[in-house]
């Protein structure tokens, strides 16, 4: 499975979209987990709503939000207020009982904001409303680069 590299600016939001075959993964919850080491386990960060028919509702754990468009086959994860410690290897997973199928591997890289060393002035980053927005996860304000490369053996 190829690894997608996503870069986000510290302090901003990074949006990750993992696409999947909607029919194949029908009825399955999705999860976002963080890989602990190259061969280590993947530690669950957040998963979609426990009721699959409500998977489009945003579920949050700390600064990470997940929502699943089950009809379109896209699960969206938003990492808010990105910090250096958020950098690392993650997975989008499809859950089936106790089994987890990897949909996508994502390497998150955090770039230091050059404004951190200067006076940020009146820079304003919009906060997401907590109101119901269904599958409409807000667009990331970060500058994303998306490249794929084959996994190293």
């Amino acid at each position: 499975l190829n690894t997608t590299v996503l870069q986000g600016m510290a302090g901003q939001s990074l949006r990750v979209s993992c696409t999947y075959d909607a029919l194949k993964h029908w009825g399955r919850r999705k999860a976002w987990c963080r890989q602990l080491g190259e061969e280590g386990p993947c530690q669950r960060v957040v998963s979609t709503h426990g009721v699959w028919l409500l998977a489009f509702l945003k579920k949050r754990n700390g600064s990470t939000v997940i929502a699943d468009d089950t009809l379109a086959g896209t699960v969206t994860i938003t990492l808010k207020n990105l910090q250096a410690g958020d950098a690392g290897l993650y997975q989008c997973q499809s859950l089936r009982g106790r089994e987890a199928e990897v949909l996508q591997k994502v390497l998150v890289e955090v770039l230091e904001d050059p404004l951190d060393d200067q006076d940020a002035g009146d820079l304003w980053v919009p906060e997401e409303s907590s109101s119901f927005e269904g599958a409409q996860v807000e667009h990331s304000t970060s500058r994303n680069q998306e490249t794929s490369f084959p996994p190293t053996s």
Epitope: G27, V51, L53, L57, G134
Partner: antibody, heavy 126, light 106 residues
């Protein structure tokens, strides 16, 4: 006029089966998720289960106490939602309501229920 | 499972009074909460969804607020037709209702 009408309630012995119907009119039935709720005499409301809109192909979810005993289905051609209740217990005695989930513009639904039927009484007793 | 605790279980107020009902969730449910009104012998009626959004056609004297674990439902000026039992309902985990609050006129 948007309307839901339940039918099929009555007195039934424990262990037996009963099928409730919820006939919809005044709206495009297939575009909405439908849910069943119940209310035991003098008690509060309890969610029983729901079925997704046509786009979800009849996908259902149930509360733990009825899972494996109750089945929700829908007939789009007749605009009817059904609640098939098997292995009934005395604790299933209640008024059963069907309700429509709110619809959002972008095609998803909302688990707030904006149209309700008048209810049908189910009594499980020997 | 999430527990929804509604209080008070009943209250008596005069016409024109401000009435407040609270609903407390056993864990954070963000704003995934609805409020319903049920008059005796009738089906429930949706009043508020997403904790604070007024359903179409519902009088503006009804309002809701809160997020996380603590929610409030308010009738700004109680009317005789508001005699009913009011229920909160979460949808963060399943669809769990509070125990209800019966509102009567003094």
């Amino acid at each position: 006029e948007v309307q839901l009408v339940e039918s099929g309630g009555g007195l039934v012995q424990p262990g037996r089966s009963l099928r409730l119907s919820c006939t919809a009119s005044g709206f495009t039935f297939g575009d909405y998720a439908m849910s069943w709720f119940r209310q035991a005499p003098g008690k509060g409301l309890e969610w029983v289960g729901f079925i997704g809109s046509k786009a979800y192909g009849g996908t259902t979810e149930y509360t733990a106490s009825v899972k494996g005993r109750f089945t929700i289905s829908r007939d789009g051609s007749k605009s009817i939602a059904y609640l098939q209740m098997n292995s009934l217990k005395t604790e299933d005695t209640a008024v059963y309501y069907c309700a429509r989930g709110k619809r959002r513009d972008y095609g998803y639904w909302h688990p707030a229920f904006d149209v309700w039927g008048q209810g049908t009484m189910v009594t499980v007793s020997s | 499972d999430i527990q929804m605790t509604q209080s008070p279980s009943s209250l008596s107020a005069s016409v024109g009074d401000r009435v407040t009902i609270t609903c407390q969730a056993s864990q954070d449910i963000t704003n995934y909460l609805n409020w319903y009104q049920q008059k005796p012998g009738k089906a429930p009626k949706l009043l508020i969804y997403d904790a604070s959004n007024l359903e179409t056609g519902v009088p503006s004297r009804f309002s809701g607020s809160g997020s996380g674990t603590d929610f409030t439902f308010t009738i700004s000026s109680l009317q005789p037709e508001d005699i009913a039992t009011y229920y909160c309902q979460e949808y963060d985990q399943y669809l769990t209702f509070g125990g209800g609050t019966k509102v009567e006129i003094k």
